[in-house]
Amino acid sequence: KLLQVSTIAMQQQEKLIQQERALLNFTEWKRSCALQMKYCQAFMQNSLSSAHNSSPCPNNWIQNRESCYYVSEIWSIWHTSQENCLKEGSTLLQIESKEEMDFITGSLRKIKGSYDYWVGLSQDGHSGRWLWQDGSSPSPGLLPAERSQSANQVCGYVKSNSLLSSNCSTWKYFICEKYALRSSV
């Protein structure tokens, strides 16, 4: 009888040890989860704050409303300028309004002075129509002031506060444009 009681007692003790181990494992697991939760929260907080602090435009780009602009420091022909903008995930500048034109020309005056800058405007060889690179027509107030006498392809550029035209194979600075990143916070 005594042997039976002591066997039961040993079994109970073994069960108790197992339960304590399980409890210890559970506590450890809970602590680990809490730490992971804290880590996740911190990570999310960092992500949110860095997103909040991140500039709507890349370094060395200028912001105006929903757009970012890059004014090149090198010369290239129109087609190469287009490629250079694509490398940056942007396109040659497309001027949508007089306000945008005024901002661009004002910024250029501050940055570099009176130089020539390619924009995303070109003249169709057959029809003679001016079109932005996305296929849209410029508003009447934003047509190049002078018609180039070139027999080659003709492209648009900005100089001082005017929109002008020239042989696309001439070398000029250029301006790229992309959308400004909207803050999600």
Epitope: L86, K87, E177, K178
Partner: nanobody, 116 residues
């Protein structure tokens, strides 16, 4: 290594349509822009159309109003819908990727022939 797989080329009659596809796969972390270029025999390779990761587009004068470029960012795929095709559109069409790393990748090309 980055692979670009072009498809959709073929023989089509003048006035017809084709849709080219280019799927980028491999170790591209981020794409800044994808474009279509073409090269006819004896000519230089020229940009036909391109689209940036923000959806900004650019077209060659000769295809404006006829061709439309679009993309599926999730699949790293770019499409070129070509309508009102002309014999002068005959060329090998190449896909190009401008990666954020500064690297550029070209596809092997797909032949487009416009002939009656």
């Amino acid at each position: 290594q980055v692979q670009l797989q072009e498809s959709g080329g073929g023989l089509v009659q003048p006035g017809g349509s084709l849709r080219l596809s280019c799927a980028a796969s491999g170790s591209i972390s981020s794409i800044n822009a994808m474009g279509w270029y073409r090269q006819a025999p004896g000519n230089q390779r020229e940009l036909v159309a391109a689209i940036t990761n923000q959806g900004r587009v650019t077209y060659a004068d000769s295809v404006k109003g006829r061709f439309t470029i679009s993309r599926d960012g999730a699949k790293n795929t770019v499409y070129l819908q070509m309508n009102s095709l002309k014999p002068e559109d005959t060329a090998v069409y190449y896909c190009k990727v401008f990666a954020a790393s500064g690297m550029e990748y070209w596809g092997k090309g797909t032949q487009v022939t416009v002939s009656s």
